[in-house]
């Protein structure tokens, strides 16, 4: 008999290399039985995971699995980092493995900023 626990299928040490300025959808695969759980995304900041409140999310339902999607429209350099989805189910909190976004700043790659600009915008060095 299949377990009716909620399961979050983000692979351990999963990562995505993405470009700033373009959209991206970060998917949290969710398996559940009857009632869809309440799922949230958070971003890791050291040992704490900060809940992403004002971000666009949606559900995509497929036959055997659902996806809770965090939308980046578009990806920003500040989106670089690790994310985790969590599900509340029957007063239990289930947390996924973290998934890491590596953001490449296409503007810095194409425009080759000056030393002064690099000093004032150190985030250009992400990749």
């Amino acid at each position: 008999k299949e377990s009716c626990d909620v399961q979050l299928y983000i692979k351990r040490q999963s990562e995505h290399s993405i470009l700033a300025g373009d959209p991206f959808e970060l998917e949290c695969p969710v398996k559940y039985c009857a009632n869809r759980p309440h799922v949230t995304w958070c971003k890791l900041n050291g040992t704490t995971c900060v809940k992403l409140e004002d971000r666009q999310t949606s559900w995509k339902e497929e036959k055997n699995i659902s996806f809770f999607i965090l939308h980046f429209e578009p990806v920003l350099p500040n989106d670089n980092g690790s994310y985790r989805c969590s599900a509340n189910f029957q007063s239990n909190l289930i947390e996924s493995h973290s998934t890491t976004l590596y953001v490449t700043d296409v503007k810095s790659a194409s425009e080759r900023p000056s030393k002064d600009e690099m000093a004032s915008r150190p985030w250009l060095l992400y990749r």
């Epitope: 300025g21 373009d22 959209p23 004002d54 578009p74 920003l76 503007k107």
Partner: antibody, heavy 120, light 106 residues
């Protein structure tokens, strides 16, 4: 310098399809997104959609079924197609460049706009 | 859809006075942009991401706020500041604008 210029018909008939072209200079369509925004006479601004640098699009859900945005990187052109035009679609249509900073995204350079009147 | 409600719809002030324009969002947004539009012209960026002045915008313009409540302040009005001001959110598609506040000379 950065410029965007809209071109297309000033007058279209109801039920017809509107095609507007945005020709840009001073930046690459592979690095920056281009948005379409409209403004009916005396009214507020309405975001229609965007062509992202990588070639994907996003649309205003209320108009998605009527809109198509395409681009030609080599010609530095972005094209808006809007089907089944109605008199309520009479507006000034702007193409606008989108740009990101470290932690926000905004529209910085605007075209002059082109007034499209829908009337029989 | 996030609805942005600007108040007042019209603000009548004299040059030298302080103008305070409000924008309230129907749901929390990460930040707010502000644009200025003069008759017959395209909007121009004024304030990015709540409080960052766009290139060439004088220091008399400032922005503040968080969550659902945002404010644009013009500390001392110059004759060229009389225009329509729009707030704009880029947190959730559709990316909406307020209905505008018309700043007119008293």
């Amino acid at each position: 310098q950065v410029t965007l210029k809209e071109s297309g018909p000033a007058l279209v008939k109801p039920t017809q399809t509107l095609t507007l072209t945005c020709t840009v200079s001073g930046f690459s369509l592979t690095t920056y997104g281009v948005h379409w925004i409209r403004q009916p006479p005396g009214k507020a601004l309405e975001w229609l959609g965007v062509m992202w640098p990588g070639g994907r699009t996003s649309y205003n859900p209320s108009l998605k079924s009527r809109l198509t945005i395409t681009k030609d990187n080599s010609k530095s052109q972005v094209v808006l197609t809007m089907t089944n035009m109605d008199p309520v679609d009479t507006a000034t249509y702007y193409c606008v460049r989108g740009d990101y900073e470290y932690d926000y995204y905004a529209m910085d350079y605007w075209g002059q706009g082109t007034l499209v009147t829908v009337s029989s | 859809e996030i609805v942005l409600t600007q108040s007042p719809a019209t603000l009548s002030l004299s040059p030298g006075e302080r103008a305070t324009l409000s924008c309230r969002a129907s749901s929390s947004v990460s930040y707010m942009h502000w644009y200025q539009q003069k008759p017959g012209q395209a909007p121009r960026p004024l304030i990015y991401a709540t409080s960052n002045r766009a290139t060439g915008i004088p220091a008399r313009f400032s922005g503040s706020g968080s969550g659902t409540d945002y404010t644009l302040t013009i500390s001392s009005l110059e004759p060229e500041d009389f225009a329509v001001y729009y707030c704009h959110q880029w947190s959730s598609n559709p990316y909406t604008f307020g209905q505008g506040t018309k700043l007119e000379i008293k």
